[in-house]
C-alpha cells in the first residue's frame, strides 16, 4: 500500500488559557529525511491553513515567529501545540504530513482532532 496513514486524537479540550496540544503520528512508507507538517482547520467545507513547518528528521520543528503553533518531533511523531485559542476557534483541526524528500513524495491526511475551546468566565468583582 502506498498510502501514508496519519493518526491523531479524535477530541482535545483546550486549557483555560486557550492552549491545546495533540500528537500527530504518521506511518512513513519510505525513509523520509525532510517532512512538512501542516495544521488545517475545517469549518463546514472550508479548509484553512493554521500553521506549517518543514523539518529535517532528527531536528526540531520550526514554525514562523508569528505562528500560533509550536511543536516537537520524535521519529514519526509530532507533538503540536496551538496557542491563543478562543471559543470561536472550536472546530476540527487536521494534521497534514508531506514527505518532501527523498523521492517519492507522500501525502498523509489525518481524520482531524475536534478541539473544544471554552472562554474563561470573567472574574466577578469582589467587594471587601
Amino acid at each position: 500500500c502506498k498510502a501514508m496513514h496519519v493518526a491523531q486524537p479524535a477530541v482535545v479540550l483546550a486549557s483555560s488559557r486557550g492552549i491545546a496540544s495533540f500528537v500527530c503520528e504518521y506511518a512513513s512508507p519510505g525513509k523520509a529525511t525532510e517532512v512538512r507538517v501542516t495544521v488545517l482547520r475545517q469549518a463546514d467545507s472550508q479548509v484553512t491553513e493554521v500553521c506549517a513547518a518543514t523539518y529535517m528528521m532528527g531536528n526540531e520543528l520550526t514554525f514562523l515567529d508569528d505562528s500560533i503553533c509550536t511543536g516537537t518531533s520524535s521519529g514519526n511523531q509530532v507533538n503540536l501545540t496551538i496557542q491563543g485559542l478562543r471559543a470561536m476557534d472550536t472546530g476540527l483541526y487536521i494534521c497534514k504530513v508531506e514527505l518532501m524528500y527523498p523521492p517519492p513524495y507522500y501525502l498523509g491526511i489525518g481524520n482531524g482532532t475536534q478541539i473544544y475551546v471554552i472562554d474563561p468566565e470573567p472574574c466577578p468583582d469582589s467587594d471587601f
Epitope: 500500500c1 502506498k2 498510502a3 501514508m4 496513514h5 512508507p29 525532510e34 512538512r36 501542516t38 488545517l40 479548509v47 484553512t48 491553513e49 506549517a52 487536521i94 497534514k96 518532501m100 524528500y101 523521492p103 517519492p104 513524495y105 507522500y106 501525502l107 498523509g108 491526511i109
Partner: antibody, heavy 118, light 108 residues
Framework: EVQLVESGGGLVKPGGSLRLSCAAS????????MHWVRQAPGKGLEWVSF????????YYADSVKGRFTISRDNAKNSLYLQMNSLRAEDTAVYYC???????????WGQGTMVTVSS | EIVLTQSPGTLSVSPGERATLSCRAS???????LAWYQQKPGQAPRLLIY???SRATGIPDRFSGSGSGTDFTLTISRLEPEDFAVYYC?????????FGQGTKVEIK
C-alpha cells in the same frame, strides 16, 4: 477573483525550447504546492511536474525528466515551466493546477497550447 | 507508479438515468487520496470529488463517490444535459501523481 492564467505556448520545432508561465491571483500563492498537467490532442490527462511551497522540492514525470524544469516566484505569484529539447510527443495543452490543502487539484488554468512540429 | 484503469471507456446514457463509472488502482490507494474530475470539450478539468467521497465546493449532490482500497466508483444519480463529458479519476497520495485514462459519458 481566484484564478490561474497560463501563457507562453506556441509552435516550436523539434529540439527547440519554450517557457510557459502561470499567473496566480486571488489567493496566497506561497501557501500552495503547484503542478503542471498536460493533455495531448484527443488524449487524457498526464501529470508533468510538481513544485513545493518554497520551490525547494521538485518532481517530474519520467517522460520529461532532464528536459523540463519547473520553478516559481512567490513574490510575483508566478509558476513557470522551462521546456527544452522538445519532441513531437510533447505537443499538448499545458495546464497549471493548484493543489488544495487536502491534496486534489482544485484550481486549474485555462491551458496553453504547445505544438512541436517541423 | 500507481496505474488507474477506468471502465467503461464510453458510457451511453439517456438524460435522467443513472451513470456508474469505475476506477481500479494497480495497488491500494488510501480513500483520502482519490479524486474525480469532469472535463468538457475545450475546457480545463473541474474537481468533482476528493477523498473518494467528499464533494468539492459547488458540486451538486447528484454526484457521489464511493470505494476504498483499489476499487472506486463515481455515480451520477440523474444525468442532466450538462453532465455529458469526460470523467477522470486521480490518485494524489504519492508521486508520480496519476490519472485514469478517462470515461466518456455520452447521450444515448
Amino acid at each position: 477573483e481566484v484564478q490561474l492564467v497560463e501563457s507562453g505556448g506556441g509552435l516550436v520545432k523539434p529540439g527547440g525550447s519554450l517557457r510557459l508561465s502561470c499567473a496566480a491571483s486571488g489567493f496566497t500563492f506561497s501557501s500552495y504546492t503547484m503542478h503542471w498537467v498536460r493533455q495531448a490532442p484527443g488524449k487524457g490527462l498526464e501529470w508533468v511536474s510538481f513544485i513545493s511551497y518554497d520551490g525547494n522540492y521538485k518532481y517530474y514525470a519520467d517522460s520529461v525528466k532532464g528536459r523540463f524544469t519547473i520553478s516559481r516566484d512567490n513574490a510575483k505569484n508566478s509558476l513557470y515551466l522551462q521546456m527544452n529539447s522538445l519532441r513531437a510527443e510533447d505537443t499538448a495543452v499545458y495546464y497549471c493546477a493548484r493543489t488544495s490543502h487536502l491534496g486534489p487539484f482544485d484550481l486549474w488554468g485555462q491551458g496553453t497550447m504547445v505544438t512541436v512540429s517541423s | 507508479e500507481i496505474v488507474l484503469t477506468q471502465s467503461p471507456g464510453t458510457l451511453s446514457v439517456s438524460p435522467g438515468e443513472r451513470a456508474t463509472l469505475s476506477c481500479r488502482a494497480s495497488q491500494s490507494v488510501g480513500s483520502s487520496y482519490l479524486a474525480w474530475y469532469q472535463q468538457k470539450p475545450g475546457q480545463a478539468p473541474r474537481l468533482l470529488i476528493y477523498g473518494a467521497f467528499s464533494r468539492a465546493t459547488g458540486i451538486p449532490d447528484r454526484f457521489s463517490g464511493s470505494g476504498s482500497g483499489t476499487d472506486f466508483t463515481l455515480t451520477i444519480s440523474r444525468l442532466e444535459p450538462e453532465d455529458f463529458a469526460v470523467y477522470y479519476c486521480q490518485q494524489y497520495g504519492s508521486s508520480p501523481w496519476t490519472f485514469g485514462q478517462g470515461t466518456k459519458v455520452e447521450i444515448k
